[in-house]
């Protein structure tokens, strides 16, 4: 199926950039892994590189404003032509959910007192209005809550006086057009515009005040245009040569507003000045290589030794990582394939243990399912060996920093009658639905 | 363990509807995502529909979009493919499929077979013209 092709792929908002035109297949456009694509305007864009997971997305508002709720956030495996870590394909959403609290209580309603007594009359002539008052106390409202209804309601007057109205100006009415709409002619054009007494009109009974000033006024007609003369296109030019050397570019023709130029304001040419068209290569954009993520350290060892474990001996291990995705005369990646670094091992020791704080609550498991839970622990965590932190291994290279390695076998007393892990698990509370928001299809 | 049995199936001309029907034995399908998928003879499996387990959201292949309708009888622990103006290209198997709730969501997510955990041995639809 054809596609819309963008050069450009920005990742902190997900969006295409640089529309450079549909009709093109997935194939063509991702000759090039900078550029990027939408299957239709407005839908999900996929950049062209090997697919790797968004950042996460902010959480969620909770799903109550008051006690406890939860909330969600998701990522999006993005990217094309692979699958990312999980297994998954490009397209689909990972969902996080955890418990939240915008505010402990819930707002309680309070009730009204009885009204105080009526204000004086708004006004000295005619008729206005008259307020009284009542107070949010009986009971007073609890956590942000109020009272239903009104603080002050308001009801008419009447003074039983007549008031006297002064006349006043409405607006000026608009400027007359002018005899000439561009200068020369035989007449000096003028232009006028009056207004009334009427805003309002000034009372009879008791009499008011006319309103100052004339009712109309005259000026001449300055800065009229010489008459204006309409811009005119020039033939196309020739066609760019295709500017890029891989994947797909725009070339372009462009034209000039000179037969005839506008003149005196006369309108500019309508329409545009370039066109642009998609030209293909059809070969290849070079892909740089990609380092994947640290492998495991490997044991602990000293050579020559059969095992170093449970001893003050220090050891050597690595690990080591592969450049992934280099084609088409790439970059290789950057940087060392292997890491070394100088070790204990304490690989199945016996060793003294103590119980953990509390953990932070964990996550709520399954976020897109029924039922979720939250869980929290504590670990029988071990006492480490007071050995050197640091060793010199070989005459004239210095002190290297020792990382103990391996897992250990802590011993602490029983808590809860359990001797490595005690673990407490919560339901989680008015759980939102996992819905994608881009919405690809319903 | 769950265990899905569809039903349903059977030979009808062009233009003619089935009502596709699967059933669990063992746990309630209130819980899981739900999916159909179908396979004529010498192809790929190919995914049909799907629905996310509180139905917020469900998903038809181009092919049988505006023809086909998924919906679920959480009572009836009953998952159902209604399929209308049916044409001899709608041919196959027809499979269901479970998936027990995870971290992960969207069209992409539920049109791979990989994403579900259990299947149903299938019922035949035959469209002839």
């Known amino acids: 199926d054809p596609v819309l092709c963008f050069t450009q792929y920005e990742e902190s908002s997900g969006k295409c950039k640089g529309l450079l035109g549909g009709g093109v297949s997935v194939e063509d456009c991702c000759l090039n892994t900078a550029f990027a694509y939408q299957k239709r305007s407005g839908g999900l864009c996929q950049p062209c590189r090997s697919p790797r997971w968004s950042l996460w997305s902010t959480w969620a508002p909770c799903s109550v404003t008051c006690s406890e709720g939860s909330q969600l956030r998701y990522r999006r495996c993005v990217g094309w032509n692979g699958q990312c870590s999980g297994k998954v394909a490009p397209g689909t959403l990972e969902w996080q959910l955890q418990a939240c609290e915008d505010q402990q209580c819930c707002p309680e309603m309070g009730g009204w007192s009885g009204w105080g007594p009526w204000e004086p009359c708004s006004v000295t002539c005619s008729k206005g209005t008259r307020t009284r008052r009542r107070a949010c106390n009986h009971p007073a409202p609890k956590c942000g809550g109020h009272c239903p209804g009104q603080a002050q309601e308001s009801e008419a007057c009447d003074t039983q006086q007549v008031c006297p109205t002064h006349g006043a100006w409405a607006t000026w009415g608009p400027w007359t057009p002018c005899s000439a709409s561009c200068h020369g002619g035989p007449h000096e054009p003028k232009e006028t515009r009056s207004r009334k007494c009427s805003a309002p009109e000034p009372s009879q009974k008791p009499p008011g005040k006319p309103c100052p000033g004339l009712a109309y006024e005259q000026r001449r007609c300055t800065g009229l245009p010489p008459c204006p003369v309409a811009g005119g296109w020039g033939p196309w030019g020739p066609v760019s040569p295709c500017p890029v050397t891989c994947g797909l570019g725009q070339t372009m023709e462009q034209r000039t507003c000179n037969h005839p130029v506008p003149q005196h304001g006369g309108p500019f040419c309508a329409g545009d000045a370039t066109r642009t068209h998609i030209c293909n290569t059809a070969v290849p954009c070079p892909v740089d290589g990609e380092w994947d993520s640290w492998g495991e350290w490997s044991p602990c060892i000293r050579r020559n030794m059969k095992s170093i474990s449970c001893q003050e001996i220090p050891g050597q291990q690595s690990r080591g990582r592969t450049c992934r995705g280099r084609k088409f005369d790439g970059h290789r990646c950057a940087g060392q394939q292997q890491d070394i670094r100088h070790c204990y091992s304490i690989q199945h020791c016996p060793l003294k243990g103590s119980w953990s704080e509390w953990s932070t609550w964990g996550l709520c498991m399954p976020p897109c399912g029924p039922n979720p839970t939250r869980a929290r622990q504590r670990l029988c965590t071990p006492l480490l060996p007071k050995y050197p932190p640091t060793v010199s291994m070989v005459e004239g290279q210095g002190e290297k920093n020792v990382t103990f390695w391996g897992r250990p076998l802590p011993r602490c007393e029983e808590l809860q009658g359990q001797k490595l892990v005690v673990e407490e698990k919560r339901p989680c509370l008015h759980v939102p639905a996992c819905k994608d928001p881009e919405e690809e299809e319903l | 363990q769950v265990r899905l049995v569809e039903s349903g199936g059977g030979l009808v001309q062009a233009g003619d509807s089935l009502r596709l029907s699967c059933a669990t034995s063992?746990?309630?399908?209130?819980?899981?995502?739900m999916g159909w998928f179908r396979q004529a003879p010498g192809k790929e499996r190919e995914f049909v529909a799907a629905?996310?387990?509180?139905?917020?959201?469900?998903y038809y292949a181009d092919s049988v979009k505006g023809r086909f309708t998924i919906s679920r009888d959480n009572a009836k622990n009953t998952v159902y493919l209604q399929t209308n103006s049916l044409k001899p290209e709608d041919t196959a198997a027809y499979y269901c499929?479970?998936?027990?709730?995870?971290?992960?969501?969207?069209?992409?997510?539920?049109?791979?077979?990989?994403?579900?955990?259990?299947w149903g041995q299938g019922t035949q639809v035959t469209v002839s013209s």
């Open positions: 063992g746990r309630t399908l209130s819980s899981y995502a």
């Open positions: 499929a479970a998936e027990e709730p995870s971290k992960y969501s969207g069209r992409s997510y539920y049109m791979m077979g990989a994403s579900y955990d259990y």
């Open positions: 629905t996310t387990w509180r139905d917020t959201s469900t």
